[in-house]
């Protein structure tokens, strides 16, 4: 939606720095937007020699870079922090790195968890 009415979305939530930033560590985040504003889900992570370190996941404010993306795909070649965003409930559960310059596609599957809703 995001055209004429407020949008509500649900995203997977995670914050590695949750204690300092006074948030929950993980769960589900219900995002409630302003009128005519889109909301997205996002994921950010680091890749240290093939080891994935999740940094943050959650709701992302209206951003044209995220429009009409059904899947969370990071396209930067080799950043310090990988980032992807998408539209659709829980679309940030799985996230992928597919560099624009070509190279192997790497998809990250989340471990099974019992998520709690953040309010």
């Amino acid at each position: 939606s995001g055209r004429g009415e407020a949008e509500t979305r649900e995203c997977i939530y995670y914050n590695a720095n949750w204690e300092l930033e006074r948030t929950n560590q993980s769960g589900l985040e219900r995002c409630e937007g302003e009128q005519d504003k889109r909301l997205h889900c996002y994921a950010s992570w680091r890749n240290s020699s093939g080891t994935i370190e999740l940094v943050k996941k959650g709701c992302w404010l209206d951003d044209f870079n995220c429009y009409d993306r059904q899947e969370c795909v990071a396209t930067e070649e080799n950043p310090q922090v990988y980032f992807c965003c998408c539209e659709g409930n829980f679309c940030n559960e799985r996230f992928t790195h597919l560099p624009e310059a070509g190279g192997p596609e790497v998809t990250y599957e989340p471990p099974p968890t019992a998520p709690t809703l953040l309010t």
């Epitope: 720095n17 930033e21 959650g58 992302w60 404010l61 951003d63 044209f64 870079n65 950043p79 980032f83």
Partner: antibody
Amino acid sequence: QVQLVQSGAEVKKPGASVKVSCKASGYTFTSYRMHWVRQAPGQGLEWMGFIVPSGGSTSYAQKFQGRVTMTRDTSTSTVYMELSSLRSEDTAVYYCARVSMYAPEPMDVWGQGTTVTVSS
Amino acid sequence: DIQMTQSPSSVSASVGDRVTITCRASQGISRWLAWYQQKPGKAPKLLIYAASSLQSGVPSRFSGSGSGTDFTLTISSLQPEDFATYYCQQAFSHPWTFGGGTKVEIK
């Protein structure tokens, strides 16, 4: 419309404390965090910390730890920033700023600022 | 703490000029970057968030770009009301930090 209105200018002596208020209106008070930023005369912006109005939890920059206390009153949609053991270097304009709970957390609405002068 | 370095610290320009301000983070912050405009005696005003998203009500002559450590604010055609100081700010990691500011002055 969305507004943050801060209390008036203060003049304090070194060693004293100051308490600045920031009254929010035009939005759901508990749906946004409130951050505090200060600016010394002719200088840049310095982040001090924030309060989560819904639960009252706080996080402060290490520089201000032990000297700053941020509180809120949900019945009046007001947040407060108290700075103790004032010194001349604390002379600055203090701003409150509303921040979305959602990433990437921009400071989208600011108060008009409160000038605090510390002088003997 | 993440250091934010802005350049130049000041720039002289004329109405109609294209002005570019850069901001560099000491470590990767992905797209957790905002730009603010501040005029003398006034509170800062949000221009850009998420490195490139224009805040509602901000003229389209302002644009932001970049990701990771290097970011740019561009004013495509400077207007009289754009003479001000501009700050970048990261919200990726606490403590949040600001750049030192860039003053855009009349040539």
